[in-house]
């Protein structure tokens, strides 16, 4: 196991998940940690704890590796980081990777106000209620510019999303979570439609689909841990 | 489905030696990296050897240099040969699998392991 040196000379290496940082329960994902071609051994570490090793063979790629999990679940969600040795010498540990779990217990229904298609301009809130109480809920737009937005809520919440522009136009779902990485299964998707303006925008987005597998999230993560690009909308307000 | 049982566990006085066995049901062993967990009476379980798929071993600091854990794909079976044996190794000992894997990834952590045995009592007692 990897002993803490305040040396820690070599660049952090870099973790990401494949599919996608949001896995449906039962379901495998690839965990990937990329460090340095002279690499002789990679760690990777489950909130804090030694999770997994991999010494990889040099007739292989040695800068980076892959971990499997082949049954993600509540016990293997959560924040995820890497580390390699070269020589005697480790890395810094790379950025968090926050794995979350879907899929589990509930499907919250998910509803716009004042309605799915609305002219360019116009004041739009999304709903998301689900029977069994939770802490949290999250929407998610499928296929676009990624936004998360979550607010607290015990069996409902609402999203106000201010004067829609044709941005905000695509398909969302939401979920309900019971702790920020175990997620109920999602909803069934909403398309927002946008009318008017200078060109006719009320198309939806093209081949919409209802795998999360089609999520686009950008899987490498900045300093603070979320999801880089990703716009994450951070709305603790209080129901 | 796999299913994993145990065998080899006993009474041993403190400087012997027991071999564990874990026979695993199923064609997917070759892909499964494989390990050995312990829970002493009263205490949590805790990690002892793991081996991957490609032989790759990692142990806990408290067992290195007397036990050695070992595979036979072509009996299914993994292997855990216990030496030096102490009053606090006592405890059950548990045969875990992942399955599938890939790569030469050794596992440490209960919660990536997704096949369990029944475990097998192990007591070291003058």
């Known amino acids: 196991q990897r002993i803490n040196t305040e040396k820690e000379t070599l660049p952090k290496p870099i973790i990401w998940a494949k599919p996608s940082i949001m896995v449906t329960n039962g379901n495998s994902v690839n965990i990937w940690c990329q460090g340095a071609q002279s690499a002789s051994e990679y760690q990777l570490y489950f909130e804090g704890s030694f999770f997994a090793l991999e010494r990889p063979k040099p007739s292989r790629s040695m800068n980076k590796v892959r971990f499997f999990i082949s049954q993600m679940t509540s016990h293997t969600a959560g924040i995820y980081t890497c580390f390699y040795q070269s020589g005697e010498l480790w890395s810094k540990s790379s950025n968090p990777l926050k794995l979350v779990v879907t899929g589990l217990y509930d499907t919250p229904n998910l509803w716009v106000y004042p309605r799915p298609e609305v002219t360019l301009g116009e004041n739009v809130t999304f709903f998301c209620q689900l029977k069994t109480a939770t802490s949290k809920f999250f929407l998610l737009k499928e296929r676009g510019s990624n936004h998360i937005q979550n607010k607290y809520g015990n069996i409902q919440a609402e999203f106000p999303m201010g004067p829609v522009t044709r941005a905000h136009r695509g398909t969302y779902r939401c979920f309900g979570s019971y702790n920020d990485y175990a997620w109920s299964f999602p909803s069934e998707p909403v398309t927002l439609l946008i009318t008017g303006g200078v060109e006719n925008s009320s198309l939806a987005p093209t081949d919409p689909t209802s795998s999360l597998d089609y999520w686009e999230f950008d899987l490498s993560t900045n300093e603070s841990g979320l999801q880089k690009d990703s716009a994450f909308w951070d709305h603790t307000t209080q129901n | 489905e796999v299913q994993l049982v145990e065998s080899g566990g006993g009474e041993v006085q403190p400087g012997g030696s027991l071999r564990l066995s874990c026979a695993a049901s199923?064609?997917?062993?070759?892909?499964?990296?494989m390990g050995w967990f312990r829970q002493a009476p009263g205490k949590e379980r805790e990690f002892v050897a793991a081996?991957?798929?490609?032989?790759?071993?990692y142990y806990a600091e408290s067992v290195k240099g007397r036990f050695t854990i070992s595979r036979d794909n072509a009996k299914n079976t993994v292997y855990l040969q216990m030496s030096s044996l102490r009053a606090e190794d006592t405890a059950v000992y548990y045969c875990?699998?992942?399955?599938?894997?890939?790569?030469?990834?050794?596992?440490?952590?209960?919660?990536?392991?997704?096949?369990w045995g029944q475990g097998t009592l192990v007591t070291v007692k003058p």
């Open positions: 875990a699998a992942v399955v599938p894997t890939y790569g030469s990834s050794i596992y440490v952590h209960s919660a990536a392991y997704n096949y």
């Open positions: 199923g064609r997917t062993f070759a892909s499964a990296a």
């Open positions: 081996i991957s798929r490609s032989d790759d071993t």
